[in-house]
């Protein structure tokens, strides 16, 4: 999906919110300088690449961030503030039901959201270009 | 083990510029987050800004847009923080104080003093 | 900005003591705050972070409580290297902002 048409502002707003207290509530316990930052993004659309891949595709020692409440709030910002972004999901999403596992927090899926914290501050950056 | 090692304290004009340095040690310099809080006497601390030392990018405090400047020096793995226009209520302690994406500060300099006075 | 209303300002005690010190935020920080310990000429200390979690080396007398808008700091039996400056901060949002200290001294 290409986020260049999204409504950077709304879901900015949407992060203020909501989403930045919902990964603030997951990151509970964890220490400061316990995670380097890895990822990086250079404007809003590959911010938002970087977000959606990090959230919603499995990695090795994180099963799956998507049933957290960060993530469901973060898919229906995109599905109401970029145009055509749900319809690409439709698949996505019946995947996901298939592998659908119990939740836990693992060390892993804490540095993943650690690294969600850093690109949604880089996301939230009043001047960062939006191409 | 990270430690934060500041400059001496300045003694100032009002209307003059300070700036404070930040060497750090004992880390990668670029996984963390460099921020600058101050203490005036009998004052809350006051949180002034940030720094990302993977890009230079800076967050300030609306109080201070516009006098403050925080920079890097990447090869010194150094962080300076400049105020300008000083009156004599920026007569503080200013500290320099490390985080990860998580804004708790557990590593601190350990302060430098500056006075305002004509 | 988020403010966070710290009290009581000045407090007296004896070493031994249980005192509690409590800090309001303006609207809700989760459980996003840490509190310090300054004394004199020095630099702030991290106490407790999560509201609640110890900080590497700090002494099981002190406990932190609370979410949302209060949070308490506790102290469960004063001994004579805890009279100090305290301070609570908020990290839930930017900006960060701490409270203005409660200054326990010895009575």
């Known amino acids: 999906y290409d986020f260049t048409n999204c409504d950077f502002e709304k879901i900015k707003a949407a992060y203020l919110s909501t989403i930045s207290k919902d990964l603030i509530t997951y990151m509970s316990g964890t220490k400061s300088t316990e995670f380097n930052n890895t990822v990086s993004c250079s404007n809003r659309p590959h911010c938002l690449t970087e977000i959606q891949s990090l959230t919603f595709n499995p990695t090795a020692g994180c099963a799956s961030l998507a049933k957290e409440m960060f993530a469901m709030k973060t898919k229906a910002a995109l599905a109401i503030w970029c145009p055509g972004y749900s319809e690409t999901q439709i698949n996505a999403t019946q995947a996901m039901k298939k592998r659908r596992k119990r939740k836990v927090t693992t060390n892993k899926c804490l540095e993943q959201v650690s690294q969600l914290q850093g690109l949604w501050r880089r996301f939230n950056r009043p001047l960062l270009k939006q191409q | 083990q990270v430690q934060l090692v500041q400059s001496g304290a300045e003694v100032k004009k009002p209307g003059a510029s300070v700036k404070v340095s930040c060497k750090a040690s004992?880390?990668?310099?670029?996984?963390?987050?460099m921020h600058w809080v101050r203490q005036a006497p009998g004052q809350c601390l006051e949180w002034m800004g940030e720094?990302?030392?993977?890009?230079?990018?800076?967050d300030y405090n609306q109080n201070f847009r516009g006098r403050v400047t925080i920079t890097v020096d990447m090869s010194a793995s150094t962080a300076y923080m400049e105020l300008s226009s000083l009156r004599s209520e920026d007569t503080a302690v200013y500290y320099c104080?490390?985080?990860?994406?998580?804004?708790?500060?557990?590593?601190w300099g350990q302060g430098t003093l500056v006075t305002v006075s004509s | 900005d988020i403010q966070m209303t710290q009290s009581p300002s000045f407090l007296s005690a004896s070493v031994g003591d249980r005192v509690t010190i409590t800090c309001k935020a303006s609207?809700?920080?989760?459980?996003?705050v840490a509190w310090y310990q300054q004394k004199p000429g020095k630099a702030p200390k991290l106490l407790i972070y999560?509201?609640?979690m110890r900080h590497t080396g700090v002494p099981s007398r002190f406990s932190g409580s609370g979410s949302g808008t209060e949070f308490t700091l506790t102290i469960s039996s004063l001994q004579p290297e805890d009279f100090a400056t305290y301070f609570c901060?908020?990290?839930?949002?930017?900006?960060?902002?701490f409270g203005c200290g409660t200054k326990l001294e010895i009575k």
């Open positions: 104080a490390l985080t990860g994406t998580i804004n708790y500060f557990d590593y």
């Open positions: 004992g880390y990668t310099f670029t996984s963390y987050l």
């Open positions: 720094i990302d030392p993977s890009d230079s990018y800076t």
């Open positions: 609207q809700d920080v989760v459980t996003a």
């Open positions: 999560w509201a609640s």
């Open positions: 901060q908020q990290y839930s949002s930017f900006t960060f902002t």
